[in-house]
């Protein structure tokens, strides 16, 4: 049997050591003990008694099925206890009585059906994070379960086999910053929602089939809910259940952010929110995020005209990797307050983008992200976006563009352009001179000779440049990142010719460690202030004698350099 390895600060690692019991020889010097991935099965009353100063105890996936009632009695300093993914079919309040300092407790993934006969947590007054439940057996949440807990930063409940929720079970916790609920269906959702309205600031619902969700008025008095964010992950919705969910918003008037991640919509977008009387109550929602939305019948999807009015005040919308090929012109025109729009990883092409960015579309838009779509012509793209009078930032990275023409038109306020990973080989005057930030990283550029009088930041890593670009091209440059190119050297003169340069990242290039370069680096200790990745990323490529040495450590041969 292997032994523990401990460092000088008392952090002991005993993961995956084939322990069949808690190892002997534990001492009061231990601050942290990780015995995960063993085959311990049993923790006896004396096994941990020597660990009086232990602050962290991690016992996950160690096949523990029995813990004696007083096994943790000496662990008054313990702040972090992880018992997740073991074989504990019942939980005992006597384990937690002595753990008055505990801040983090993870009991998830054990095969218990309830949280025990009596309240488990009344002494855990410092608890900040609690994770409970499992996929297959945890079937009941009762009023006694959370007694004694008044405030939590994070509460995660995996109740994917829930058969009974006792009303008001979660109401006793007065303040929960982030509640994650794994529910397989919506059966108890309304009851739970009523209980957490006045306590939860961020509610995350996971893996819930909401297809049969039906709203009914909540049995609550006028409540000022602190909920600011609502997220659905891995959920299933229909057009009808979406309408029903919207009715919940009348109870959370401070809601500012809604997120749908990895969800499925078994519908056509035939929403009818006017019936749900929520149009005015969506007033505070500023951010809507949709990622990986799966719509089996996306090719029959409606134009969403029924939700136009819902979204008039929204400022930030992300719809990522969801097969978006068109935002109808009339929809774009209704998004009057929209300042940020991210349509990354979709199916946008120029002809449909033209319809989306029609006259009067997105009048407040400042940032548009069209990364990884199917755009081909930089010239057309710029021309189409001329309608966006307030656009300052455009990300069209990860599109495969045709060669860049000599001239292009762009929105006149544009200051930031991301052309990374677009396959470009040459930069031309198509790139607007108004830019303050330009990202052309991960392309096939072997030179850069474009005058950009206002450019403050240039990102040109992962290209094929052999030298730093000429400083006269960028008179006000502050930041240049030129990692992973083929730059072989830089000199005092080169760096000095950038009058305002504050940050240069030039590591992982093919440096030829010549006498000049090495004497410059030796004579200039201030390099560390400008080269943010100095010294570890600056290695000699040649001569062979110095290959792999850091420039900082490499010493030129006296013979070579003083001939």
């Amino acid at each position: 049997q292997e032994s523990l390895s401990c460092d000088a600060s008392g952090v002991c690692d005993g993961r995956s050591r084939s322990f069949t019991s808690i190892p002997s020889g534990l001492t009061a010097a231990m601050k942290s003990l990780d015995l995960s991935f063993n085959k311990i099965t049993y923790i006896g009353h004396g096994d941990l008694r020597a660990c009086a100063n232990l602050q962290v105890l991690i016992l996950k996936s160690s096949r523990i099925n029995t813990i004696e009632g007083d096994a943790f009695y000496s662990l008054g300093s313990l702040e972090h206890l992880d018992l997740s993914d073991n074989h504990l079919s019942s939980l005992s309040s006597s384990w937690f009585g002595p753990l008055s300092s505990l801040k983090y407790l993870n009991l998830m993934g054990n095969p218990y059906q309830t949280l025990g006969v009596t309240s488990l947590f009344p002494n855990l007054t410092n608890l900040q994070t609690l994770r409970i439940g499992n996929v297959e057996t945890f079937s009941e949440i009762r009023r006694i379960d959370f007694a004694g807990l008044t405030s939590l930063n994070e509460l995660e409940i995996k109740a994917l086999s829930l058969r009974n929720y006792q009303s008001q079970s979660l109401k006793s916790i007065r303040d929960i910053h982030h509640l994650t609920l794994h529910l397989s269906e919506s059966a108890f959702l309304l009851e739970i929602f009523a209980d957490i309205l006045s306590s939860v600031r961020y509610l995350e619902l996971r893996d819930t089939n909401l297809a049969r969700f039906q709203f009914s008025p909540l049995p609550v008095d006028e409540v000022s809910s602190p909920m600011k964010k609502l997220a659905f992950r891995g959920s299933v919705l229909t057009d009808e259940s979406f309408n029903e969910l919207l009715k919940l918003l009348r109870y959370i008037l401070e809601l500012s952010e809604v997120e749908f991640d990895d969800c499925t919509l078994n519908g056509l977008g035939d929403f009818n929110p006017s019936e749900s009387d929520v149009v005015s109550e969506l007033g505070k929602v500023e951010t809507v995020t949709i990622r990986r939305l799966h719509i089996p019948q996306f090719y029959l999807f409606y134009d969403l005209s029924t939700v136009y009015s819902l979204l008039e005040k929204v400022k930030r919308i992300t719809v990522e990797n969801s097969k978006v090929f068109l935002v109808p012109c009339s929809f774009s025109q209704h998004l009057k307050s929209l300042e940020f729009l991210d349509l990354s990883e979709n199916l946008m092409v120029e002809e449909y983008l033209k319809n989306s960015a029609c006259k009067g579309a997105w009048p407040s838009l400042q940032t548009l992200v069209l990364s990884q779509n199917h755009l081909r012509s930089m010239q057309k793209t710029g021309e189409i976006l001329l309608t966006l009078k307030n656009l300052t930032s455009l990300d069209i990275s990860r599109n495969t563009f045709h060669p860049m023409p000599d001239s292009c038109q762009w929105p006149e306020k544009m200051r930031f352009l991301n052309l990374s990973s677009t396959g470009i080989r040459v930069v031309k005057t198509c790139i607007p001179q108004t830019l303050e930030v330009l990202d052309v990283s991960n392309n096939n550029l072997d030179s850069f000779s474009l005058f950009l009088p206002r450019l403050q930041e240039l990102y040109i890593s992962r290209n094929k440049l052999k030298t730093l670009p000429d400083a006269s091209l960028f008179p006000v440059l502050l930041v240049m990142k030129i990692r992973e190119n083929a730059v072989s050297t830089f000199s005092k003169d080169q760096l000095g010719s950038f009058p305002k340069l504050e940050t240069l990242e030039a590591g992982d290039n093919h440096f030829v460690c010549s006498c000049e370069l090495l004497s410059f680096t030796m004579e200039t200790p201030a390099l560390a202030q400008i080269l943010v990745d100095w010294p570890d990323s600056y290695l000699c490529d040649s001569p062979p004698r110095l290959h792999g040495h850091r420039l900082q450590d490499a010493r030129p041969s006296v013979l070579e350099c003083h001939q």
Partner: nanobody, 122 residues
Framework: EVQLVESGGGLVQAGGSLRLSCAAS????????MGWFRQAPGKEREFVSV????????DYASSVKGRFTISRDNAKNTVYLEMTSLEPEDTAVYYC???????????????WGQGTPVTVSS
């Protein structure tokens, strides 16, 4: 209606590995949550693992976590169970199931395969 056919079971020595497959017929495979269950001789059917429609969420019984891995390929209408560090206690008939709910309760699954036997010898 979905038909499920498991394969990949067999006899393996303790510490060995197996990969179970479950092929589904029907065009709506990606609309279902997929689960693996097992039943040892003389015992009740027990939950092993579950994966959501996209493959973005997975869960395991504590007895197999860290040793088994569930995955799915919606293009091939197939769900897999990669089993490593097998133990004699893993001997059972393994069933694949499809349903609408992401859960470990077997009764919530609508469609079941015929099962594939796995025997782990010591």
């Amino acid at each position: 209606e979905v038909q499920l056919v498991e394969s990949g079971g067999g006899l393996v020595q303790a510490g060995g590995s197996l990969r179970l497959s479950c092929a589904a017929s029907g065009r709506t495979f990606s609309s279902y949550v997929m689960g693996w269950f097992r039943q040892a001789p003389g015992k009740e059917r027990e939950f092993v693992s579950v994966i959501n429609r996209s493959g973005g969420s997975t869960d395991y019984a504590s007895s197999v976590k860290g040793r088994f891995t569930i995955s799915r390929d919606n293009a091939k209408n197939t769900v897999y169970l990669e089993m490593t560090s097998l133990e004699p206690e893993d001997t059972a008939v393994y069933y694949c199931a499809a349903g609408e709910y992401y859960t470990g309760i077997s009764s919530r699954y609508d469609y079941w395969g015929q099962g594939t036997p796995v025997t782990v010898s010591s």
